[in-house]
Interface confidence: medium
């Protein structure tokens, strides 16, 4: 019978940050500068990301794994690994599918992220409008007519409002 | 009332396409959300088709669907609808039409807030 | 292809059970927070529960909440009710060359 021999690949013993250069029989030689490899045995070793314009580096590159981009002030990470930036919305904004679009008539935002949510409505709680909503702000409740009588008690915060989670009619 | 209502043959031959028409009441096509198509086979999950921006008439389509599938809308019937080609025993499922919700100032949000009830749709000789 | 993968694939549950679904994602949604969760029952259409990756839509009880970011969300029931027996999916939307959507593999939560 024939014997059989070790099929095992000489690369396989090159580590993590190295890659088994064919042009030097094989040998396990370091990644050169600007690139990695983050698995043992590559052949090649793969060129680092680099972080430009809107994106900044948050984690350097090393030889065993690829530099990690996030955005600059006024935007914010999409996709994986961060391969987009978005602008911020504004307060008084929502990010939809079209972008940054002002809060309509009835609802608030006062983040840069998130969805606009309606304005407290002072009237289920036995309250009055103190101080008118805004696109970027939610309306201040205060008391009931019936209660500002001398002693009466001082603004109480809205209640926290919910999305209704549909479409407008 | 607001609803969606999907219509067509619920028997069609393989190799042949399969057409499906969504009737949308309750609400019109004046902003810029998407109507989107849903398919969940028997006994398993739900499975995104594709979907149309009613503001633009944009398509997008999973990547499985791209050259079988073409989603058109209507409006001036208030509908939009599904055509899947050469159609094979695996595409058999109950279909469903969705609307994307929409966000306070009108435009798509990325999730659906409103479903027809689905029309089941075998593929067989 | 984007994959949404959810956890467990079915569970036995009681009433007043705390019930935890997660759903992890082969790329991050758009915005890190464009995640929906839906409740089906046989027969019947899927029902919004949780948009944003943790907003209850309307008419959903507190029981229901939603939390995570980018790849990674949960669903809980704080106290499971008789009639949260259902299967219930995630649904992710995203944006690379084109926008996209994609539905999580389903969650059976049976008594």
């Known amino acids: 019978f024939e014997r059989t021999r070790s099929l095992q690949d000489p690369c396989s013993n090159c580590p993590a940050g190295t890659f088994c250069d064919n042009n030097r029989n094989q040998i396990c030689s370091p990644c050169p500068p600007n690139s990695f490899s983050s698995a043992g045995g590559q052949r090649t070793c793969d060129i680092c990301r680099q972080c430009k314009g809107v994106f900044r580096t948050r984690k350097e590159c090393s030889s065993t794994s690829n530099a990690e981009c996030d955005c600059t002030p006024g935007f914010h990470c999409l996709g994986a690994g961060c391969s987009m930036c978005e602008q911020d919305c504004k307060q008084g904004q929502e990010l939809t599918k079209k972008g940054c679009k002002d809060c309509c008539f009835g609802t608030f935002n006062d983040q840069k992220r998130g969805i606009c949510r309606p304005w407290t409505n002072c009237s289920l709680d036995g309250k009055s409008v103190l101080v008118n909503g805004t696109k970027e702000r939610d309306v201040v409740c205060g008391p009931s007519p019936a209660d500002l009588s001398p002693g009466a008690s001082s603004v109480t915060p809205p209640a926290p409002a919910r999305e209704p989670g549909h479409s407008p009619q | 009332q607001v609803q969606l209502q999907e219509s067509g043959p619920g028997l069609v031959k393989p190799s042949e396409t399969l057409s499906l028409t969504c009737k949308v009441s309750g609400f019109s096509f004046n902003n810029d959300y998407d109507m989107c198509w849903i398919r969940q086979p028997p006994g398993k999950g739900l499975e995104w088709i594709g979907c149309i921006d009613t503001g633009d008439g944009s398509t997008y389509y999973a990547s499985w669907a791209k050259g079988r599938v073409t989603i058109s809308v209507d409006s001036s019937k208030n509908q939009f609808s599904l055509k899947l080609s050469s159609v094979t025993a695996a595409d058999t499922a109950v279909y469903y039409c969705?609307?994307?919700?929409?966000?306070?100032?009108?435009?798509?949000?990325?999730?659906?807030?409103?479903w027809g009830q689905g029309t089941l749709v075998t593929v067989s000789s | 292809d984007i994959q949404m993968t959810q956890s467990p694939s079915s569970l036995s549950a009681s009433v007043g059970d705390r019930v935890t679904i997660t759903c992890q994602s082969s790329q991050s949604v758009y915005d890190n927070n464009w995640l929906a969760w839906y409740q089906q029952k046989p027969g019947k259409a899927p029902k919004l529960l949780i948009y944003?990756?943790?907003n209850l839509a309307s008419g959903v009880p507190s029981r229901f909440s939603g939390s995570g970011s980018g790849t990674d969300f949960t669903l809980t029931i704080s106290s499971l009710q008789p009639e949260d027996f259902a299967t219930y999916y995630c649904?992710?939307?995203?944006?690379?060359?084109?926008?996209?959507?994609?539905f999580g593999t389903g969650t059976k939560v049976t008594v």
């Open positions: 969705a609307r994307e919700a929409a966000s306070s100032s009108g435009y798509g949000m990325g999730y659906f807030d409103l």
């Open positions: 944003r990756a943790s």
């Open positions: 649904q992710g939307t995203y944006l690379s060359s084109n926008w996209y959507w994609a």
